[in-house]
């Protein structure tokens, strides 16, 4: 946020940019957390926009029995590897077709033992506060489906009738990695020394990192006619004085009519 300065006072302003603000010849360029002519004000909301999607990766091993291992399968650029990859990918796309979070598979290694396929199953979901549950559920369904297909699609008399056949006992889930996204942690970090006073509130399942000085949220501080300002000791209401009233109190809700005060003073005189 920037405020432009014109006239003689500008040089003076330059040396007074606060909170790490830098003078660009016209104005104070403020760091993310601050705004105002001198970067003296603390922002009331910080953009912690979550990623659009969250990913998970499952490391799996299956044993394919309907293809005999050859040395060429170790070479990822060989025609053998490419054909195997194509069939395996098509087969897995069928296996996981009912899982909306399924993105695809990535073969990491093929080794001897019929063909032992070390691969990653890739999952992705739209960010919502429940993304962990969504991906946990998806990984469970992946386990169920791969267990089922490797139990059902098996060789009979050294022949496979399916696109691929498997060894029932060769199916293992090695590891599951979910991209971590913690809006509360991000909010605290980005609010720096004001971290104790910024909170995450959700609107339309999107997280907002806000201080009580941001209007329209459940934690918002109502300063009435005053102005909410953040300081290191927390949010405070700066009360205004109008032509007719002085305002005071924690939330500037106590108005004193000037005429009454003046009248009172005159009365005392």
């Amino acid at each position: 946020r920037t405020t432009t300065c014109f006239g003689d006072g500008c040089q003076n302003t330059a040396s007074r940019c606060k909170n790490g603000g830098t003078w660009d010849g016209l104005k104070c360029q403020c760091p993310n957390l601050y705004y105002g002519e001198l970067c003296e004000e603390v922002v009331s909301s910080i953009d912690i926009g979550p990623p659009e999607t969250i990913s998970a990766q499952m490391e799996l091993t299956v044993t394919v029995t309907s293809v005999k291992f050859t040395e060429e399968l170790k070479n990822h650029s060989s025609q053998e590897f490419q054909e195997f990859k194509q069939t395996f990918t098509e087969q897995m796309n069928i296996v996981y077709s009912g899982i909306p979070e399924y993105v695809g598979v990535n073969i990491t290694k093929l080794r001897l033992g019929s063909v032992v396929v070390e691969h990653d199953v890739l999952l992705r979901t739209k960010y919502t506060p429940e993304y962990k549950t969504v991906l946990d559920n998806a990984t469970e369904v992946v386990k169920e489906k791969i267990t089922k297909v490797t139990t059902q699609q098996i060789m009979i008399n050294d022949i496979c009738s399916d696109m691929m056949c498997f060894n029932t006992t060769g199916t293992q889930v090695q590891n599951i990695t979910v991209t971590q996204y913690d809006p509360e942690e991000d909010c605290r970090k980005m609010a720096k020394e004001y971290g104790d006073y910024f909170v995450v509130e959700y609107r339309d399942q999107k997280p907002y990192c806000i201080s009580p000085c941001e209007p329209g949220f459940s934690v918002s501080k109502n300063c009435n006619l005053g102005k909410c300002q953040m300081s290191l000791s927390g949010p405070q209401c700066l009360c205004v004085t109008t032509e007719t009233h002085w305002y005071s109190g924690e939330t500037c809700n106590q108005g004193t009519q000037k005429s009454l005060v003046y009248g009172h003073h005159h009365h005392h005189h």
């Epitope: 029995t65 293809v67 005999k68 053998e80």
Partner: nanobody, 123 residues
Framework: EVQLQASGGGSVQAGGSLRVSCAAS????????WGWFRQRPGKEREAVAL???????FYADSVKGRFTISQDNTKNTLYLQMISLRPEDTAMYYC?????????????????WGQGTQVTVSS
């Protein structure tokens, strides 16, 4: 990339013989798997005879003892010798190949296909 060209189909009386051929170009013939599949009208494509570079062969029960699959590596050609033909052998015959050593009858596992040659057996 393997290209396959099937030929040799035709019409024959029941009990007769035919030999269909499949010429391969673009790759060596010595590795992987080769096969003959057929598709009868209104039916799914099915495996008839398969052969792999490790010596493994397969024949569908309905053709055992009547059909023989073979290959000539010097000519890069696959053959299917058919004797004692029956009306139910009437179909479009396709040759297929894969650089993988396969043990599957499922056409979806086979990557390269010829265009097909028609075999008609009348009673």
């Amino acid at each position: 990339e393997v290209q396959l060209q099937a030929s040799g189909g035709g019409s024959v009386q029941a009990g007769g013989s035919l030999r269909v051929s499949c010429a391969a170009s673009g790759d060596t013939f010595s590795r992987g798997s080769w096969g003959w599949f057929r598709q009868r009208p209104g039916k799914e494509r099915e495996a008839v005879a398969l052969i792999s570079s490790d010596g493994w062969t397969f024949y569908a029960d309905s053709v055992k003892g009547r059909f023989t699959i073979s290959q000539d590596n010097t000519k890069n050609t696959l053959y299917l010798q058919m004797i004692s033909l029956r009306p139910e052998d009437t179909a479009m015959y396709y040759c297929a190949a894969s650089v993988l050593v396969l043990r599957t009858l499922n056409p979806k596992a086979w990557h390269h296909w010829g265009q097909g040659t028609q075999v008609t057996v009348s009673s």
